[in-house]
């Protein structure tokens, strides 16, 4: 009888592990979808514009290498910021390198004073890991400098030349990013 109970418990445990694995796979799939969508949008934009001689970035967007950036003039909470960027065929800024960070902070200094700008960085509620919107982890030099004391979800923002963290429900400006169009020449 005891052996039977033990076997059932082991089977349940195995089932639970499989479900957890499936959930983890689904989460990873969801993250990769966001990245694929970003690439897909960029590809479509490049394809559609190849017939015309258009500038690499839309009006009011700033270009740096292969990227176009939009510095918002409106406040949003983090999730709405992401929605705003998506409507423009872009995503919240993902900072890949110190060079990109320097370009962004340098541009912000020229455009505006020392304001807060949401970027596409959020903290996973369970693991506490920082993740970009595509599911990748920021490089060690690009982790938010201070850990927010908020019990709510925590997201990353840029201020002056620092990457910081705050409750995702606070209102801030935001920065969108998309791929620059390839020249059709």
């Amino acid at each position: 009888k005891l052996l039977q109970v033990s076997t059932i418990a082991m089977q349940q445990q195995e089932k639970l592990i499989q479900q957890e694995r499936a959930l983890l796979n689904f989460t990873e799939w969801k993250r990769s979808c966001a990245l694929q969508m970003k690439y897909c949008q960029a590809f479509m934009q490049n394809s559609l514009s190849s017939a015309h001689n258009s500038s690499p970035c839309p009006n009011n967007w700033i270009q740096n290498r292969e990227s176009c950036y939009y510095v918002s003039e409106i406040w949003s909470i983090w999730h709405t910021s992401q929605e705003n960027c998506l409507k423009e065929g872009s995503t919240l800024l993902q900072i890949e390198s110190k060079e990109e960070m320097d370009f962004i902070t340098g541009s912000l200094r020229k455009i505006k004073g020392s304001y807060d700008y949401w970027v596409g960085l959020s903290q996973d509620g369970h693991s506490g890991r920082w993740l970009w919107q595509d599911g990748s982890s920021p490089s060690p030099g690009l982790l938010p400098a201070e850990r927010s004391q908020s019990a709510n979800q925590v997201c990353g923002y840029v201020k002056s030349n620092s990457l910081l963290s705050s409750n995702c429900s606070t209102w801030k400006y935001f920065i969108c990013e998309k791929y620059a169009l390839r020249s059709s020449v």
Partner: nanobody, 116 residues
Framework: DVQLVESGGGLVQAGDSLRLSCAAS????????MAWYRQAPGKEREYVAV????????HYSDFVKGRFTISRDNAKNTVSLQMDSLKPEDTAFYYC?????????WGQGTQVTVSS
């Protein structure tokens, strides 16, 4: 095409109050974050306040914090701006619009003049 209509402005004394209202034709405001802006003569349009679509979250520019209150009535499809302790520097045309990158065509605005 959507039309934003602002109302409630007027000429008041410093320290007085006014309540501005914003309505939209042919568009349901309840699904949008909404914002109030103002533009003084010879100056750029500036952000005043913003309210979330549900109305449970608001944010204000430093120069109006504690004096102005943004609210909304989703049943009536309106957004309001209660302005208390008005100052001469609040004199401007006030406009409402959706709080998104691509905004709707601007309305005529409503003029607020605060005399000292």
């Amino acid at each position: 095409d959507v039309q934003l209509v602002e109302s409630g402005g007027g000429l008041v004394q410093a320290g007085d109050s006014l309540r501005l209202s914003c309505a939209a034709s042919e568009r349901n405001l309840r699904i949008y974050d909404m914002a109030w802006y103002r533009q003084a003569p010879g100056k750029e349009r500036e952000y005043v306040a913003v309210i979330s679509s549900s109305g449970d979250s608001t944010h204000y520019s430093d120069f109006v914090k504690g004096r102005f209150t943004i609210s909304r009535d989703n049943a009536k499809n309106t957004v309001s701006l209660q302005m208390d302790s008005l100052k001469p520097e609040d004199t401007a045309f006030y406009y409402c619009n959706v709080n998104q990158i691509r905004q709707w065509p601007w309305g005529q605005g409503t003029q607020v003049t605060v005399s000292s």
